[in-house]
């Protein structure tokens, strides 16, 4: 069995398959590494595009697992970033393995908006709550924000009534329809006994990436009475 002392200058293998996955703007780096006789440790560095004097910043240092949460090291989620990972076995280090370019807003996934549906007098009110995401460790909604390009620009709302589907588009910048917590859609109640089922997805500004589609929520109207 080969000890650390026997490893040549370039004999510490480089990590492979460095990938970045992001859900709700919470990016995590993953990589693979071959089985070694001695436990390797890894250092992960991040470089943000568009940052003045951009340089490699340590995100995780000397960790033994094969993932690293880099959410605290992301600047503008619309900007590109790169990640590199190196391994260390004993006193020797591998070369860096580099990720592909990644932009949290463009390449990540965002969860669905939450929906609430209710009847108010002669109309059905649908509340579309912005998905919550984590930016620099802080929870916030992906509502319209003129200071960033990473926000939900429009909601596609799908209303199924007695089998036929109708689509509504809601622009989030319009303050009458939306605020920093939610958007609202009102539709008239038909006089017939009807079931209304609603789902929605957000579309992000710039790249047009869509959030996950919400689960359908339904309400049934029986002769002006209501059953959720």
């Amino acid at each position: 069995e080969m000890g650390t002392a026997d490893l040549g200058p370039s004999s510490v293998p480089t990590p492979t398959n460095v990938t970045i996955e992001s859900y709700n703007m919470n990016p995590i780096v993953y990589w693979e590494y071959q089985i070694m006789p001695q436990v390797p440790v890894f250092t992960v560095e991040v470089k943000n595009y568009g940052v003045k004097n951009s340089e490699w910043i340590d995100a995780c240092i000397n960790i033994s697992h094969h993932y690293c949460n880099i959410s605290d090291h992301v600047g503008d989620p619309s900007n590109s970033l790169w990640v590199r990972v190196k391994a260390r076995v004993g006193q020797k280090e591998s070369a860096y393995a580099k990720s592909e370019e990644f932009a949290v807003c463009r390449d990540g996934k965002i969860g669905p908006p939450k929906l609430d549906i209710r009847k108010e007098e002669k109309q059905i009110m649908i509340d579309i709550f912005h998905p919550s995401v984590f930016v620099n460790g802080d929870e916030q909604e992906v509502d319209y924000d003129p200071e960033t390009t990473c926000y939900i620009r429009v909601y596609n709302v799908y209303v199924r009534m007695n089998g036929s589907e109708i689509q509504y588009k809601i622009l989030t910048q319009k303050e009458d329809d939306c605020d920093e917590i939610q958007c609202q859609l009102a539709i008239p109640v038909s006089s017939l006994n009807s079931q209304y089922c609603v789902s929605a997805e957000g579309v992000l500004h710039v790249w047009g990436v869509t959030t996950e589609k919400s689960k359908e929520v339904c309400i049934t109207i029986f002769n002006s009475s209501i059953k959720g």
Epitope: Q123, Y168, K169, I170, L171, E175, L185, I187, P188
Partner: nanobody
Amino acid sequence: EVQLVESGGGLVQAGGSLRLSCAASGSTFSTYVMGWFRQAPGKEREFVAAISRSGGTTTYADSVKGRFDISRDNGKNTLFLQMNSLIPEDTAAYYCAARAGPAIGRTANDYHSWGQGTLVTVSS
């Protein structure tokens, strides 16, 4: 009650474009949900598009989705319908309609104020 007057109709070749306008007067325009409907000869009046009071929410009939664009200018009390890639089946009288309150209707019964209509003819 709001009064509505449509304009912008006319004869156009298939594949062409038209922009309809609907001027509102007599009431605060921004308090109304607005819609466009059309009625071809011998047919029932059908929904085309509707827009919320602020202009932020829109909905379209499947037959015009991707070709027609509804918008409004609350400062000028005017509703618009931009019609592109017109086809002969779009030939009809086009009516604008108003509905008080926030609910965005898609049936003629949902609207209480109507214009007199403007005729759009699409030749093949």
